[in-house]
């Protein structure tokens, strides 16, 4: 990964001497905690016959507020700390004069990263110890000597999870416009295994590479109106916490099992990504659970396969794309990648070939928007605690922070006429700039549908005439009958559905007698009253890869990696007529209802999953007794 002559693995490169442009004379006083690296910096690079001027700003949103680092201390104990003084040297930006350009670089010891102009992706890295003014190699990814890497997610596994693949789904959007929905945020936890640690040699080198990788991933996702924020880094500097197998599917299962056990004492995050120095079998460099974002299986494994960190960043962006419901581009008829063919493929191509991709295809974007319509995706809607983002509020980072009315990104990327991108204040005459209840800079009238009902456990939401955001997603009252079960927090969990999720389409719930067992470590069965709750017992289907099973009679239970615990029947699962699993026992549906909530909704609304009134279009919460127009008129706040 880091040979003594870094350019030894490049076939063709150009030597450049970056020149740093002097900063503006008048600078706003920066808080002392912002550290040694300036907020903004510009460099001129002479490469491929052009002078490129890169304008960069520090990625202030790279690290979440409670960012932690976990490693093993010299005495063998596990240490988790919140590093203080989180100044860093990771930047993002654009190339002057190129409207759809992008740049993601670190300036810690010379310039390292990528900048993209049109269809050309240029990689840059130092050739010596001369710092930012020293000799640098600029080259294109296809000149990096490496083998092609593939994604281990098979077409078979994608098919059942993604549904039919037809060109009709994909209506291309203008390439330069961001999706009009609210920004989504992935709170990311990265685990670095011992092989990668050994390869890089120190905690500092690992930290630097991971921040560089996440900075690149974040830049790639910004085009989809996403931000990727690192909330935790775990470095296995002493030994691996689970077996990292050359078989990526086994490693992924081990990661997810380990994560499930750690979740109570580690960061609550949206997604976990393992970066490994282990060489996966064949050409596979990554493997992920499809459509698993926000679930207990939200994660992927990534081999650090290239000398340049952009390589594993592209792999991570690809695998995270699978977590977000994306299919491989080549599996979809009519899928359009705006990428010029000779420059390579889009991020969700099944194989990265010889060059690193830099954008998502139209069909990836369509899959993403479809995934975001699921109740499951709710974890992406909450921004990291904006009052604590490292470095404080910064205009132009897509986060609407303290003192800002809007934020549409840096001026060169902003396509939102309702927002002044230099001040992050609303444009003159604008009531709003973001949100599904904002149209042409005006708040939509009360009662307009902003989030349709997705399924029988969902409720539709309407604009309230006051706020540009659609109200929080709400679901049918827990206990409402749905296909074969009872609604629970927007899902319709049944034993059959749980067994299919683990064992594939042939999986089904085991006989009722199976549920009379509690199972102890070592697959020891203990009789218990049969109540269809407790350990999930299935039959049929295919054993999930990398999972140990416990078989008692005809009952199959999935164990955790170390065999000490078993996959439980999830809360809310139907366990009999008018009964659901609740706190590990089969209980009456009344456990969901503390009061007769619907009676309080004045026939103008229904009770939702939070036992609150969910009003029909035009009626005002909390009890749907008055029209929204009356309430607004009375408070004098009609827009």
């Amino acid at each position: 990964i880091a040979p003594s002559r870094p350019w030894a693995l490049m076939e063709q490169y150009e030597v450049v001497l970056p020149w740093r442009l002097p900063g503006p004379r008048v600078r706003r006083a920066l808080p002392s905690h912002l550290g040694l690296h300036p907020e903004r910096v510009s460099y001129v690079l002479g490469a491929t016959g052009h002078n490129f001027t890169l304008h960069l700003r520090k990625n202030r949103d790279l690290l979440g507020s409670g960012y932690t680092e976990t490693y093993t201390a010299a005495n063998g104990s596990e240490v988790t700390e919140q590093p203080r003084g989180q100044d860093h040297c990771f930047y993002q930006g654009h190339v002057e004069g190129y409207p759809d350009s992008a740049a993601s670089l670190s300036t810690c010891a010379g310039l390292r990263g990528f900048f993209q102009v049109g269809s050309d992706l240029h990689l840059i890295e130092p050739l010596d110890e001369g710092g930012e003014g020293g000799r640098h190699a600029v080259y294109q990814a296809e000149h990096l000597l490496q083998t092609a890497g593939t994604c281990g997610v098979s077409d078979d596994s994608l098919g059942s999870l993604l549904g039919p693949r037809t060109a009709a789904v994909f209506r291309p959007r203008p390439g330069d416009s961001l999706p009009s929905r609210e920004t989504r945020y992935v709170e990311l936890y990265v685990v670095v295994d011992n092989a990668e640690f050994q390869m890089l040699g120190s905690e500092a080198a690992v930290r630097h590479r991971v921040l560089e990788v996440v900075n690149h991933v974040d830049k790639l996702y910004q085009k989809l109106n996403f931000r990727v924020v690192l909330v935790g880094l775990e470095i296995w500097n002493s030994q691996d916490r689970f077996h990292v197998s050359p078989d990526p599917s086994v490693t992924l299962e081990n990661l997810l099992t380990w994560q499930a056990r750690q979740r109570t004492r580690r960061h609550l995050h949206d997604n976990v990504q393992l970066i490994t120095g282990v060489d996966f079998t064949g050409t596979t460099v990554g493997f992920a659970r499809v459509s698993a974002m926000c679930s207990h299986s939200s994660g992927a494994v990534n081999q650090d396969h290239s000398k340049n960190p952009v390589g594993v960043a592209c792999t991570m962006a690809h695998e995270m794309g699978h977590n977000l419901g994306m299919d491989h581009d080549e599996n979809v008829q009519g899928c359009r990648c705006q990428e010029r063919f000779e420059a390579g493929r889009c991020i969700m191509a099944g194989s990265i070939g010889s060059s690193f991709p830099r954008m998502f295809s139209d069909c990836s974007q369509a899959y993403l928007e479809s995934f975001l319509e699921r109740p499951q995706s709710v974890c992406l809607a909450n921004a990291p605690d904006l009052s604590h983002l490292v470095g404080g509020p910064v205009c132009g980072n897509l986060f609407v922070e303290r003192g800002e009315q809007c934020d549409c990104g840096p001026p060169e990327d902003c396509r939102n006429r309702c927002c002044n991108s230099t001040t992050c204040q609303l444009a003159e005459g604008a009531q709003c700039a973001h949100g599904t209840c904002c149209q042409e800079c005006k708040v939509k009238p009360a009662g307009e549908l902003c989030r349709p009902k997705k399924d029988m456990c969902d409720l539709e939401e309407f604009c309230d005439g006051r706020h540009p955001e659609c109200p929080e997603d709400a679901f049918q009252e827990n206990g409402t009958p749905c296909s074969g079960g009872y609604c629970y927090n927007g899902a319709c969990p049944t034993l059959a559905q749980q067994c299919q999720a683990f064992w594939g389409p042939g999986g089904q719930a085991a006989e009722e007698s199976c549920f009379s067992y509690d199972i102890l470590p070592g697959c020891k069965a203990s009789r218990y009253r049969a109540d269809m709750c407790g350990v999930l017992q299935c039959k049929g289907g295919q054993q999930p890869l990398g999972r140990a099973i416990c078989i008692v009679d005809v009952c199959h239970a999935l164990t955790t990696e170390d065999g000490t615990a078993y996959e439980p029947v999830p809360e809310g699962t139907r366990c009999g007529p008018e009964k659901v699993c609740w706190k590990g026992r089969c209980q009456d549906l009344h456990v969901y209802r503390s009061s007769n909530c619907s009676a309080q909704c004045h026939n103008h609304g229904v009770c939702n999953h939070k036992q609150e009134c969910h009003c029909h279009a035009g009626w005002a919460p909390p009890h749907c007794a008055k029209l929204l127009t009356e309430v607004h008129a009375a408070s004098g706040s009609l827009p």
């Epitope: 509690d518 102890l520 009789r527 615990a565």
Partner: nanobody, 119 residues
Amino acid sequence: EVQLVESGGGLVQAGGSLRLSCAASGRTFSEVVMGWFRQTPGMKREFVAAISGSENVTSYADSVKGRFTISRDNAKNTVTLQMNSLKPEDTAVYYCAAQRWRGGSYEYWGQGTQVTVSS
């Protein structure tokens, strides 16, 4: 709030015995599996023994079978680990653990008690 508090750890000669006790408070654990795990520096936590909530069925790691005995008193909400014929390799921090709900993983953990076996 659920709390598991271990006691009974200490220093003992090889071949000696110790009795670890775990007191649970904040909830009744009579229905769930409870267990003991141990951890030495730099190693991952390993399973030692567990006991079911209903029939008091027990399970042990191969390394402690025949030497350790787990038992529980549901009336007092306690779990005990009787450790006999102790060996230096039994030296570790011992943790009591309980499932959150029947069938789930161990989500409640004690702070641990140190057991040191000298040769």
